[in-house]
Each structure stands twice: as structure tokens, then as C-alpha cells.
């Protein structure tokens, strides 16, 4: 707390500019008044204060405005965002794209700070749902973003807004994510044509269930080793060899050097031996020629 | 963030330097500059600023000797120091925009002017 004093003589800021840079903190204190400080936020952004500097005027805004900042003084807070505390932000409505936009342009190259997530969540739950235009702005200043959301969260996501997720966005997405994705990205590219469609669902075919991956496995998309590996394992056991065979085209080849990791090593022993013969490759592992498979789940379920 | 100040040195009195301070990313292009400095025994004080419009500003005391500049393009602010006095001697450092904020700063450079 910086102690209240009188202003100096001829010290009284008339406007916020440069010159406050060379105030002692108590001089910005005594002399520079809040609600100037608030009309002209704009400025401090402009002006290099220090962070004991940006502390006295975060102390002098939230004695004006106690129950929270108005979004008018928010939108300018630049550098003075990093001075708030997540309880500081709760206190916040902010509606504005805009206002989101220049807080996280603050932090921008930086980690994602418990102050910005807080700002998010506001920000979202205000709006109610997470529309494209505000994915578009978050994965643009923070391509993680998606993944850090809980699948119940995702659910809130509008199959629009898969338009505006790029792949990177989803690489540290795991399996109980892509599988509340993926249905929002079918349905939002169900009218491209196949090889458009296989572009775009791509980074989502992680929560794809095995009878999508068999109609692909007809459209000759030509999957790429890195997309296959990260099926989930359940929707790849039951596909036949000719299915994976077409479903990766040429990049068949690329199994034999991924024979010892899931998904491929499950799918290859749940293979007959002769079948995985005829790609040629020397996968081992299949069920031997003669033995008989019981599906011991189908029976389960049938009982 | 990294800052790398450079360019001090023993000086006589009357003598010039240039001091450089470079940072990582785009951060001195976008932000508003300052020029410190801290005398031993006192606190850290702005010499000279320069707002992200370009305007410029300086301690009296310092005022009509010093000059803050900066290369863009190179991500880099210079103090350009003329009719160096004693009083000058100090270590100095250069900051702004998100590194200033958090209170993050360089090692500064080392003036001495006997």
C-alpha cells in the first residue's frame, strides 16, 4: 500500500503521459487522479512504467471501481492486464471479442497464464457457447487451446466452429477429446466431397468409430501412417486386412515398422496369418493357419 | 524474454558511449522503452524513455547529453551518452513492454566515468 500524501506543487498530472515514468510511486499516488487514469487507459500501454509503477495504478483503478472494471477501461488495460489476479478477473463482464483479443495480444508468445485462463472461462461462459469466431481468436493465441478443455466442455462446442481448427490445434488432444470431436467435425464437413472431406476430418478420425473408418477404407484417401497410429485401437481390431490395405494405399508399407506399436501390434494379432501373408510386408504375429477365432465379446453379448 | 545490455565501460570525464540492449522476440519494435540506471547504494531510475509512438523523453539530469534510440529491425535500443560526468557512474539496465511488467530484467551494463 502506498501511502496517501499531498502532491507536490506543479505535480498534479493534467493528462497520463511520459513524463508520470519519472513520478516515485507515491508521486503517482497523490498526484495522478483515477478517474483520468480510467478515461485515458489508452495512454498507459504507450508509456514504459515499471511494475512498481503499473502496481499503484492498478491500486488507484480498483478503489475507483470496486465491484469490477467497466469493459471501456478493460479493452485498454495492456500491460496492466498482468497485474490482475484471477479474483480481480471474475469480478469482469467481458463481451467484447475485441477486449479478449487485446488482453491476450498482452501476453502473447507467452504461456498461458492463470490470468488469461480465467479471462477465457469468463469470457466463454458469458457467451454461452465457444462460437467460431472466438476459436478462431483463442487457437490463433493459443493453438493448445482446444485440448485443454474437459470433453464436457467441448460438448458446448456448435459443429460450426470446427471450421476454424487447424490440425496443430489438436495435437495434444488424447482419445476422450477427439471422441466428442469427431461427430461436430462429421457432421460440419458432411457435404464436401471425399477427397475434400478426408483433408479436413483427418485430425479428427482419433474419436473415429470402425465403421467410418471401413466407408473411408472405400474412398481410396490414401491415409498417412501418422493419422492411422493415432486411431483408437477398438475401431482398428475389427478391420480386415483388405480394409487396411485400402484405407492406407500406399502407405501400407509403413506397418512393418510400426509392428510392435498399438494400434498396429493389436490389429496384427487379431489377424489370420495367410491374410497378412498376402501384403507382403513379413508381419508376424497373425493367428496361425487352422486355429478357429471365437469372439468371446459376441457371445457375451448374446447371452 | 532475454535482455542483453552491452556497451559500458570506463570512461573519462567528458567521454561518450553507446550502450546497446538487445531482446529476444519483437518485444522493443511493438513496446515502450526505458533507459535505468542504479547507482550503488540507490534505487533504480529512469534516464530516458521512448513511447511506442516514438516520442521520446529524459531526466533532467540527463537532459541535452543523452540519446534513446532504437533499430527495429534489429530489435535493439541504444543510449547514446555525451559529456559524461561522475555522477553518471551507475549500472545500467533497459526494459519494457511484458518483461517490465512482469519485473523481469537483464544484467545490465556497467559505466564508470573517472
Known amino acids: 500500500e502506498v501511502e496517501k500524501t499531498a502532491c507536490p506543487s506543479g505535480k498534479k498530472a493534467r493528462e497520463i503521459d511520459e513524463s508520470l515514468i519519472f513520478y516515485k510511486k507515491w508521486e503517482l499516488e497523490a498526484c495522478v487522479d483515477a478517474a483520468l487514469l480510467a478515461t485515458q487507459m489508452d495512454r498507459v500501454n504507450a508509456i514504459p512504467f515499471t511494475y512498481e509503477q503499473l502496481d499503484v495504478l492498478k491500486h488507484k483503478l480498483d478503489e475507483l471501481y470496486p465491484q469490477g472494471y467497466p469493459e471501456s477501461v478493460i479493452q485498454h488495460l495492456g500491460y496492466l492486464f498482468l497485474k490482475m489476479s484471477p479474483e480481480d478477473i471474475r469480478k469482469w463482464n467481458v463481451t467484447s471479442l475485441e477486449t479478449l483479443k487485446a488482453l491476450l495480444e498482452v501476453n502473447k508468445g507467452h504461456e498461458m497464464s492463470p490470468q488469461v485462463a480465467t479471462l477465457i472461462d469468463r469470457f466463454v461462459k458469458g457467451r454461452g457457447q465457444l462460437d467460431k469466431d472466438t476459436l478462431d481468436t483463442l487457437t490463433a493465441f493459443y493453438p493448445g487451446y482446444l485440448c485443454s478443455l474437459s470433453p464436457e466442455e467441448l460438448s458446448s462446442v456448435p459443429p460450426s466452429s470446427i471450421w476454424a481448427v487447424r490440425p496443430q490445434d489438436l495435437d495434444t488432444c488424447d482419445p476422450r477429446q477427439l471422441d466428442v470431436l469427431y461427430p461436430k467435425a462429421r457432421l460440419a464437413f458432411q457435404n464436401m466431397n471425399g477427397s475434400e472431406y478426408f483433408v479436413k476430418i483427418q485430425s479428427f478420425l482419433g474419436g473415429a468409430p470402425t465403421e467410418d473408418l471401413k466407408a473411408l477404407s472405400q474412398q481410396n484417401v490414401s491415409m498417412d501412417l501418422a493419422t492411422f497410429m493415432k486411431l483408437r485401437t477398438d475401431a482398428v481390431l475389427p478391420l480386415t486386412v483388405a480394409e487396411v490395405q485400402k484405407l492406407l494405399g500406399p502407405h501400407v508399407e509403413g506397418l512393418k515398422a510400426e509392428e510392435r506399436h498399438r494400434p498396429v501390434r493389436d490389429w496384427i494379432l487379431r489377424q489370420r496369418q495367410d491374410d497378412l501373408d498376402t501384403l507382403g510386408l513379413g508381419l508376424q504375429g497373425g493367428i496361425p493357419n487352422g486355429y478357429l477365432v471365437l469372439d468371446l465379446s459376441m457371445q457375451e453379448a448374446l447371452s | 524474454v532475454q535482455l542483453v545490455e552491452s556497451g559500458g565501460g570506463l570512461v573519462q570525464p567528458g567521454g561518450s558511449l553507446r550502450l546497446s540492449c538487445a531482446a529476444s522476440?519483437?518485444?522493443?519494435?511493438?513496446?515502450?522503452v526505458a533507459w535505468y540506471r542504479q547507482a550503488p547504494g540507490e534505487q533504480r531510475e529512469p534516464v530516458a524513455a521512448m513511447t511506442s509512438g516514438g516520442s521520446t523523453i529524459y531526466a533532467d539530469s540527463v537532459k541535452g547529453r543523452f540519446t534513446i534510440s532504437r533499430d527495429n529491425a534489429k530489435n535493439t535500443v541504444y543510449l547514446q551518452m555525451n559529456s559524461l560526468k561522475p555522477e553518471d557512474t551507475a549500472v545500467y539496465y533497459c526494459?519494457?513492454?511484458?518483461?517490465?511488467?512482469?519485473?523481469?530484467w537483464g544484467q545490465g551494463t556497467s559505466v564508470t566515468v573517472s
Open positions: 526494459n519494457g513492454g511484458w518483461s517490465q511488467a512482469m519485473d523481469y
Open positions: 522476440g519483437s518485444m522493443f519494435s511493438i513496446n515502450a
